[in-house]
């Protein structure tokens, strides 16, 4: 099943996707669409690139903020709403016969927590959530530590997220 990423309403969501251009600089078409990857292309395309640049965006909220020319085609959705929830497809159209790379990721948008932050949680976010967090500006902040989501409630998650001081924070759950 898809990897899940959680973002709060009004924040930026970051959905990672990348490939290694071979040779470097030899870019390939990529599409992002809402809905699982179909047999060709993307359904409900939100952003599309060609061999040179982004050439189609259905909204100004969709951005490739990574180093697109090095194959970082991670999608940033700015100012997310509940309607942005769902499965997204990143399709990398590697030239050749049935060479496409397809990546399905699930975005879960939740309402902001209306709770008092817990003052005791001052730990580093990546150690609190091994393999679970991505940030909109810095890409995946992952360790190789196996395991499931730590036994922490959403209030604590939001507290830790706020400590990032990064409006693009997206929490990833396996």
């Amino acid at each position: 099943s898809e990897v899940e990423y959680i973002a709060e309403v009004g924040q930026n969501a970051y959905l990672p996707c990348s490939y290694t251009p071979a040779p470097p600089g030899n870019l390939v078409p990529v599409c992002w669409g809402k809905g699982a990857c179909p047999v060709f292309d993307c359904s409900n395309v939100v952003l599309r690139t060609d061999n040179r640049d982004v050439n189609d965006r259905t909204s100004g909220r969709y951005w490739l903020k990574g180093d697109f020319h090095k194959g970082d085609v991670s999608l940033t959705i700015e100012n997310v709403t509940l309607a942005d929830s769902g499965v997204y497809c990143c399709r990398i159209q590697i030239p050749g016969i049935m060479n496409d790379e397809k990546h399905n990721v699930k975005l879960v948008v939740i309402k902001p927590a209306k709770v008092t932050p817990a003052p005791t949680l001052q730990r580093d976010l990546t150690s609190a959530f091994p393999r679970m967090l991505t940030t909109g500006e810095h890409g995946p902040a992952e360790t190789q530590t196996p395991g499931s989501l730590p036994d922490v409630n959403l209030t604590q998650i939001f507290t830790l997220t706020n400590e990032l001081r990064d409006s693009g924070a997206t929490i990833r759950t396996a």
Partner: antibody, heavy 117, light 107 residues
Framework: EVQLLESGGGLVQPGGSLRLSCAAS????????MSWVRQAPGKGLEWVSA????????YYADSVKGRFTISRDNSKNTLYLQMNSLRAEDTAVYYC??????????WGQGTLVTVSS | EIVLTQSPATLSLSPGERATLSCRAS??????LAWYQQKPGQAPRLLIY???NRATGIPARFSGSGSGTDFTLTISSLEPEDFAVYYC?????????FGQGTKVEIK
Amino acid sequence: EVQLLESGGGLVQPGGSLRLSCAASGFTFSSYAMSWVRQAPGKGLEWVSAISGSGGSTYYADSVKGRFTISRDNSKNTLYLQMNSLRAEDTAVYYCAKSPYAPLDYWGQGTLVTVSS
Amino acid sequence: EIVLTQSPATLSLSPGERATLSCRASQSVNDYLAWYQQKPGQAPRLLIYDASNRATGIPARFSGSGSGTDFTLTISSLEPEDFAVYYCQQGGHAPITFGQGTKVEIK
């Protein structure tokens, strides 16, 4: 109005070759994947091949892989299917279809390919 | 590859009656399921895509439903021009596959 017009069908001997063309109009051709689908006489539909809008990515059914080659010329708004090593079982009406992602939303009227000695 | 099984093979009905056609997939197709109508000597015509969305120009008497592996095409009240062969098609996984078709004939 979307229009797709196939041509190039005909009678060919087993082992022979044929090249089908599909002229497209009424939409931005280079923005869409295109497919070939065939239908043997009195039978159902069988997807044959597809190509991405840019032409870089291609897809084939196992039954034609290595024998058929799909291509496109976006400057001419034309889709092609080069068919080599034809067999009797390739006899069918061949349709080209616009394939935005999963459904085939517009079809041509088809061209008949008959493989017989 | 994903196998699509349509039932029944033939449906004998009168104009004005309701037609219910079934399509079952051997595994989930992520709701990328389409329905086509084909009349003798003509190309197939897209009726329904993504399981439940009517294609441009398709009358409201045609509706699609279902998800995952089980899908249904319903024609609420058959018109004389609706008697034809209907195919389902999945586009969730390569290769594209079609069902074997259901013929809706006049009773």
